[in-house]
Interface confidence: medium
């Protein structure tokens, strides 16, 4: 779109409230260490400037691109060099290189203090004293910790956050009302951030084609009654939206997402019968609802896929004429028939089909060569089915905590070089697949489990990319987006790993563990488990179980003692000695 003033165009489209919120998110995602007050000041300056451009689009600097305007504003921050080091060098560059430079410095694991939740009364007072500042602070704190959070969706979270405080701060029991809502928002927010991080990684590391293939598969499962043409149009628009958000173009992204929701709702009849309720909601809720809408029912009379993609004599002609369109049609037709498959499995099948056509369409008898292509799909389908079956059985047998521990041991043995906090975080999340997906019937297990695992393994990949320590992780993360999970599954114990030196300090615990929440206590124990495996990678399950049981008993005993700190000091020494003996350290 060629507008005289891009900033005026977006201000008018989005309205002042959303404009300010999105600029704050954009700035906080770029300058993650800046104090809240500094960001608010910058946002207010940009907003005032935008208003002058709305009044007169020909006013000075109103014709500048948003990247130029925002970049110039960010580069006025006085402490840029001291706070961000080499990121300050970005300011010496011209657009578009300057924006690319800022993007490259986004930190997935910023060195920021953990967000501690104040007392409910304190929060309610802050909310009532200055609602606007309170909500801005929420946007700022989430955005700086999650630099790829999907900005229009963060506006939706903020709306729910505000609604929770509006309702609960008037309730008789404020805490009982508010805390479960905040927990739910926190958990959903982390999940939303991780899902968006995978989309951005897909676009940035594997390109637009990879993202479009993912989108064709997912939208075809969700909208099986829609024409291929309609799905293609939605994919094109969705790709634009996510490319913009992942590229820091948050105003354009939010605007285009609203346009896409409008289009989908105007054309429900040719997209899905499940959209009616979503389309009656206000904009932010509508967009969220559409993104989460359940799969429509599959058309009853779908013909066999083999006719068009195997038996037809025109397969190579059609493939040659428009390769990506033909593969897109294959993916669409396969995905709409298989809501029971994960998106990554569907993409593996499409890749196998593409590889076969590339080989066979150059052969003497192409038809004979590709006639059995569907037979090659069988092992690809069975592998995730078997893996999910085995792991769900293990989960049902162990429960979530012990299942997480099994995965911690498994993954520490595969990639022991990875930092302990990363192994704990990733394995805990991998373990959540059990409670998230194993409850589902067979037909829903694979799309739930394998697509969730893709999201979690991407967390490992982006964290590892910041400080690479394992060639095996790098290989699995970079070779193929859709084969990441099979690649990690196939890793055996790393025989080249030199066990970590034993350090008693790692296994020294104090009375503060007793006041931790159950979740935080689990993390402490799981951190110890990872360290144990790093010291003794060849330890058996039985040995590790014995040590962990002793450890749990030790914590329980000392937390009940009168003099907790003395108990931890004395009993801790005994535990360390016993553990060393048990593991032969």
């Amino acid at each position: 779109d060629a507008h005289k003033s891009e900033v005026a165009h977006r201000f008018k489209d989005l309205g002042e409230e959303n404009f300010k919120a999105l600029v704050l998110i954009a700035f906080a995602q770029y300058l993650q260490q800046c104090p809240f007050e500094d960001h608010v000041k910058l946002v207010n300056e940009v907003t005032e400037f935008a208003k002058t451009c709305v009044a007169d689009e020909s006013a000075e600097n109103c014709d500048k691109s948003l990247h130029t305007l925002f970049g110039d504003k960010l580069c006025t921050v006085a402490t840029l060099r001291e706070t961000y080091g080499e990121m300050a060098d970005c300011c010496a560059k011209q657009e578009p290189e300057r924006n690319e430079c800022f993007l490259q410095h986004k930190d997935d694991n910023p060195n920021l203090p953990r967000l501690v939740r104040p007392e409910v009364d304190v929060m309610c007072t802050a909310f009532h004293d200055n609602e606007e500042t309170f909500l801005k602070k929420y946007l700022y704190e989430i955005a700086r910790r999650h630099p790829y959070f999907y900005a229009p969706e963060l506006l939706f979270f903020a709306k729910r956050y505000k609604a929770a405080f509006t309702e609960c701060c008037q309730a008789a029991d404020k805490a009982a009302c508010l805390l479960p809502k905040l927990d739910e928002l926190r958990d959903e927010g982390k999940a939303s951030s991780a899902k968006q991080r995978l989309k951005c990684a897909s676009l940035q590391k594997f390109g637009e084609r990879a993202f479009k293939a993912w989108a064709v598969a997912r939208l075809s499962q969700r909208f099986p009654k829609a024409e291929f043409a309609e799905v293609s149009k939605l994919v094109t628009d969705l790709t634009k939206v996510h490319t913009e958000c992942c590229h820091g173009d948050l105003l354009e992204c939010a605007d285009d997402r609203a346009d896409l929701a409008k289009y989908i709702c105007e054309n429900q009849d040719s997209i899905s019968s499940k959209l009616k309720e979503c389309c009656e909601k206000p904009l932010l809720e509508k967009s969220h609802c559409i993104a989460e809408v359940e799969n429509d029912e599959m058309p009853a009379d779908l013909p066999s896929l083999a006719a068009d993609f195997v038996e037809s004599k025109d397969v190579c002609k059609n493939y040659a004429e428009a390769k990506d369109v033909f593969l897109g049609m294959f993916l669409y037709e396969y995905a709409r028939r298989h809501p029971d498959y994960s998106v990554v499995l569907l993409l593996r099948l499409a890749k196998t089909y593409e590889t076969t056509l590339e080989k066979c369409c150059a052969a003497a008898d192409p038809h004979e060569c590709y006639a059995k292509v569907f037979d090659e799909f069988k092992p690809l389908v069975e592998e995730p089915q078997n893996l999910i079956k085995q792991n769900c059985e293990l989960f049902e047998q162990l429960g979530e905590y012990k299942f997480q521990n099994a995965l911690l041991v498994r993954y520490t043995k595969k990639v022991p070089q990875v930092s302990t906090p990363t192994l704990v975080e990733v394995s805990r999340n991998l373990g959540k697949v059990g409670s998230k997906c194993c409850k589902h019937p067979e037909a829903k297990r694979m799309p739930c489990a394998e697509d969730y695992l893709s999201v979690v393994l991407n967390q490992l990949c982006v964290l590892h990319e910041k400080t690479p320590v394992s060639d095996r992780v790098t290989k699995c993360c970079t070779e193929s987006l859709v084969n990441r999970r099979p690649c990690f599954s196939a890793l055996e114990v790393d025989e080249t790993y030199v066990p970590k030196e034993f350090n008693a300090e790692t296994f020294t615990f104090h009375a503060d563990i007793c006041t931790l929440s159950e979740k935080e206590r689990q993390i402490k124990k799981q951190t110890a488990l990872v360290e144990l495996v790093k010291h003794k990678p060849k330890a058996t399950k039985e040995q590790l179980k014995a040590v962990m049981d002793d450890f749990a008993a030790f914590v329980e005993k000392c937390c009940k003692a009168d003099d907790k700190e003395t108990c931890f000091a004395e009993e801790g020494k005994k535990l360390v000695a016993a553990s060393q003996a048990a593991l032969g350290l």
Partner: antibody, heavy 120, light 109 residues
């Protein structure tokens, strides 16, 4: 190369019917949206109707809704326009045009048109 | 009655630049990036010049360019040549239908 050849036009009395055909060649017909666009003598272009790739969804200008029916036969690579209850204002040169893989976007290829005259 | 508004005629000398406007509403031109432009030479079928607001169709010279601001789209022809004399139509997607402009006749003086 892409070819679209319209046929079936002619002189018809008001209230009468005609069926236009458009034979397509040089591309995979079933991949593309197809359109009918008309042009009255000395006037501009007017969009008449559109049909999706499989023929499941059809769209019409208000001026022809309820009287005209667009359809396609992908096996025969042919687009049709059944025109009933014709009026003098339907007199025009009728073009068949190929759209894109999706509904929106330009009409990249056009036939030479077939003349329809409605007169008593 | 055309839904999109174009000037009936424009003119320019060889080598010069002309711009043809196409005014619509937020439901058509202003909605999404779905404006296209066509050239119709006398006695010929229309030919696609531009699609998706500003993308040139295959084989179209870069003398033809287009853009959009708000609810108005524009086609610019630079380095005018005598063979550019023709009728030019804009079109836009609108809620499941397509709408055309009334057309603009370009005269090369």
């Amino acid at each position: 190369q892409v070819q679209l050849v319209e046929s079936g036009g002619g002189l018809v009395q008001p209230g009468g019917s005609l069926r236009l055909s458009c034979a397509a060649s040089g591309f995979t017909f079933s991949y593309y949206w197809m359109y009918w666009v008309r042009q009255a003598p000395g006037k501009g272009l007017e969009w008449v109707s559109a049909i999706d790739t499989r023929g499941g969804s059809t769209y019409y200008a208000d001026s022809v809704k309820g009287r005209f029916t667009i359809s396609r036969d992908n096996a025969k690579n042919t687009l049709y326009l059944q025109m009933n209850s014709l009026k003098p204002e339907d007199t025009a040169l009728y073009y068949c045009a190929r759209g894109g893989l999706v509904r929106v976007g330009g009409l990249g290829s056009w036939g030479q048109g077939t003349q329809v005259t409605v007169s008593s | 009655q055309a839904v999109l508004t174009q000037p009936p005629s424009v003119s320019g000398s060889p080598g010069k630049t002309v711009t043809i406007s196409c005014a619509g509403t937020s439901s058509d031109v202003g909605y999404g990036n779905y404006v296209s432009w066509y050239q119709q030479l006398p006695g010929m079928a229309p030919k696609l010049l531009i699609y998706d607001v500003s993308k040139r169709a295959s084989g179209i010279t870069d003398r033809f360019s287009a853009s959009k601001s708000g609810n108005t789209a524009s086609l610019t022809i630079s380095g005018l040549q005598s063979e550019d004399e023709a009728d030019y139509y804009c079109a836009s997607y609108r809620s499941g239908t397509t709408v055309f402009g009334g057309g603009t006749h370009l005269t090369v003086l």
